[in-house]
Amino acid sequence: MQKGDQNPQIAAHVISEASSKTTSVLQWAEKGYYTMSNNLVTLENGKQLTVKRQGLYYIYAQVTFCSNREASSQAPFIASLCLKSPGRFERILLRAANTHSSAKPCGQQSIHLGGVFELQPGASVFVNVTDPSQVSHGTGFTSFGLLKL
Amino acid sequence: MQKGDQNPQIAAHVISEASSKTTSVLQWAEKGYYTMSNNLVTLENGKQLTVKRQGLYYIYAQVTFCSNREASSQAPFIASLCLKSPGRFERILLRAANTHSSAKPCGQQSIHLGGVFELQPGASVFVNVTDPSQVSHGTGFTSFGLLKL
Amino acid sequence: MQKGDQNPQIAAHVISEASSKTTSVLQWAEKGYYTMSNNLVTLENGKQLTVKRQGLYYIYAQVTFCSNREASSQAPFIASLCLKSPGRFERILLRAANTHSSAKPCGQQSIHLGGVFELQPGASVFVNVTDPSQVSHGTGFTSFGLLKL
């Protein structure tokens, strides 16, 4: 990617944050070894990465969770990378699913999502999970980011 | 990314190598369909990718392993992407965890890690696992790389 | 990456398509929220991404599948990212393996593959799986793409 005023590097990497909120949208923070290249990408309300420039972006998320088959619903644990663009419907960009473990008290598993998508100015991306209480927030386990091509 | 003497492409992709060493740090080699763009990134001692230029890098690792719940410790299999910078603390950048399988003799699972991080000149990244003897070294199963934005 | 006639952005992201074919090669389509930057990368026969320019590419695939240990073969589910270059042998770039779940009727799991590779003009990449009938084609679950550095 080019460095320069015309075409600066745009990249972000944020770290998961435990939340008391009951929402399925994961919370993130600029803490630890985070990346926020400049104000052309911002973390809004601790929940979404918002870009100012149109273009192609590689967007990724990693979620580690700990669950048990007996204690969880029948449905698998699903992580979804979603897009919100001004004046458009929200949409799912990527999803991954893992069946709960039989390990006790719970079994850890990690999910990685990533892909190239066109984002409009003001577009936001966020990560949804089926059960945020199962997400692991230890160092490096759960993170979210993007880079502009 | 720009091509040119001023801002050459910097990228690497190395292939896992079985090792008799007892260390938890995985070993890598420039073999098979590997990538080493130029001398601005190097594989040192078969264990770490070291960069000469400061900047933002997308760093990734994939580890496939085969383990069995009864034959392994209670703790899950964990893969960690770690950073060593001159005069700084070593640090965990990314981690993924998978509970051992109940399949016999062992059950294969794959982990993928990836994220954007600022690296300083002379910084090195390496991959740690809880049990290197469980790692699968068949073609394409376990690899490690980076690219400079 | 540079924008301009000399060095345009090259990127693709395609979406899985269920297929009645008995081949192990996954089928893809330009549908939903897909990406196809220009004609320097094309989706050929719904099965492979073909590039016109030589260079380093980050190539990735995500496959979600649903399988059961009793109903499947002993062998794990394996996803392979493969390369076909003009006048060369096909080769495996990346593989991931997951042992089948004991969940009934089947347990979902997701695999992510990604790495940096040098591609020649006319090179094609495609994704092979051990059992295409087990692949999940719901929105966002299974996708395939690349970006030129």
């Epitope: 990497h13 600029e30 803490k31 630890g32 070894y33 985070y34 990346t35 926020m36 290249s37 927030h137 230890g138 160092t139 490096g140 | 933002l56 700084r88 603390f89 640090r91 965990i92 991080f117 600022e118 300083q120 | -």
Partner: nanobody
Framework: EVQLVESGGGLVQPGGSLRLSCAAS????????MGWFRQAPGKEREFVAV????????LYADSVKGRFTISADNSKNTAYLQMNSLKPEDTAVYYC????????????????WGQGTLVTVSS
């Protein structure tokens, strides 16, 4: 700013043990990690061990793995380095360091440092 005071250094025979302590005061709520570096005579300062405050994750230099253990007592705002099976090559001044909480990957923030404590391993 964080103030760090080390203690526990001294002379020990090869194969012996020592426990170093590092007491933190000041802006301790801003600490992301605490750890140890060492500097032998005529050599550069090198990383020894670190413990991260978020979840107690630890990392060690290859040269001390299996012999040294870092730990922290948050109630006392103190980090410890238990050094076992000491070797003559472990002889150095050991420095405690603290990394501020908001040190993102593009910010090479300054660490806060202690004054150092000398460890000598000799028969």
């Amino acid at each position: 700013e964080v103030q760090l005071v080390e203690s526990g250094g001294g002379l020990v025979q090869p194969g012996g043990s020592l426990r170093l302590s590092c007491a933190a005061s000041g802006s301790i709520d801003r600490i992301n990690a605490m750890g140890w570096f060492r500097q032998a005579p005529g050599k550069e300062r090198e990383f020894v061990a670190v413990i991260y405050s978020s979840d107690g994750s630890t990392l060690y230099a290859d040269s001390v793995k299996g012999r040294f253990t870092i730990s922290a007592d948050n109630s006392k705002n103190t980090a410890y380095l238990q050094m076992n099976s000491l070797k003559p090559e472990d002889t150095a001044v050991y420095y405690c360091a603290a990394e501020p909480y908001g040190s993102g990957s593009s910010l090479i923030s300054e660490y806060d440092w202690g004054q150092g404590t000398l460890v000598t391993v000799s028969s």
